[in-house]
């Protein structure tokens, strides 16, 4: 692979109201059906057109669902996770991890490893800015001496 794909990770609380046809999405993942290697988490694989999730607009295909109504989704069998959603009631609160894909360098395909990388420029830009401010302050200080 020629480049590296990184992710800017954000979390969001999404409150959905179950519609006539339910919540309107599919999931993959679980301890018995890992979608990402070394990660048994639950991921949104499909947002159904005109479903509750699609109409709300915040949940995206590829999002990781961390909890449902406050209940952690870690270390669950796939079917147990499915059942948790199906029995979650009319008002459903989802804690969701969004991953914004950021391309660094030449284009390469998306890896399946650690999904929580931080883009390098997110670190370098503030460091560079701080260095510039420090240098300016130092020069001003020398001029005053």
């Amino acid at each position: 692979m020629n480049g590296r794909v990184d992710y800017l990770v954000t979390e969001e609380e999404i409150n959905l109201t179950r519609g006539p046809s339910g919540l309107g999405f599919n999931i993959v993942g679980g301890t018995d059906q890992q979608y990402v290697s070394n990660d048994s988490g639950i991921y949104v694989s499909r947002i159904k057109e005109n479903g509750a999730a699609a109409l709300d607009g915040r949940l995206q295909e590829g999002d990781k669902i961390l909890s449902v109504n406050g209940q952690d989704l870690k270390n669950l069998l796939h079917q147990d996770a499915v059942d948790l959603f199906r029995n979650a009631g009319y008002a459903v609160s989802l804690r969701v991890q969004h991953r914004l894909q950021v391309q660094n360098g030449p284009i390469g395909h998306r890896g399946e490893g650690d999904p929580s990388g931080i883009p390098i420029f997110m670190v370098l830009v503030p460091v560079f800015a701080l260095t510039m401010v420090a240098a300016w302050a130092f020069m001003r200080y020398r001029q005053q001496l």
Epitope: L23, G24, V28, Y35, S45, R46, I47, E61, F85, R86
Partner: nanobody, 128 residues
């Protein structure tokens, strides 16, 4: 949003072979069920083949069984349709389609044959 681009179509003699490719971009490819469909001039679009998001399950229309093979390469974000022993009746525009795999959180139901969320523009296959 998923973008699908088909390639590999063309003109081939009866009995010949072609390999269609469908390159996907825009979303994590390896969570999508992928399908191939075709539409001959003046006819309805018809199902050809599907492969599940895990790659472990494939399905074929009776008319292509034993001649066509669907496969996917998640590292390359690409799905393929290997077409052998082509017949004039295989002449059509071939479309690639994608839909999120996995399990509905709402109920167990059979997903419709044409219930795909994303479609490519198609590639022409002509068998003379």
């Amino acid at each position: 949003e998923v973008q699908l681009v088909e390639s590999g179509g063309g003109l081939v003699q009866a009995g010949g072979s072609l390999r269609l490719s469908c390159a996907a971009s825009g979303r994590p490819f390896n969570m999508y069920d992928m399908g191939w469909f075709r539409q001959a001039l003046g006819k309805e679009r018809e199902f050809v083949s599907t492969v599940s998001w895990t790659g472990s399950s494939t399905n074929y229309a009776d008319s292509v069984k034993g001649r066509f093979t669907i496969s996917r390469d998640n590292a390359k974000n690409t799905v393929y349709l290997e077409m052998n022993s082509l017949k004039p009746e295989d002449t059509a525009v071939y479309y690639c389609a994608a839909r999120g795999g996995g399990t509905s959180v709402d109920s167990d139901y059979d997903v419709g044959e044409f219930e795909y969320d994303y479609w490519g523009q198609g590639t022409q296959v002509t068998v003379s």
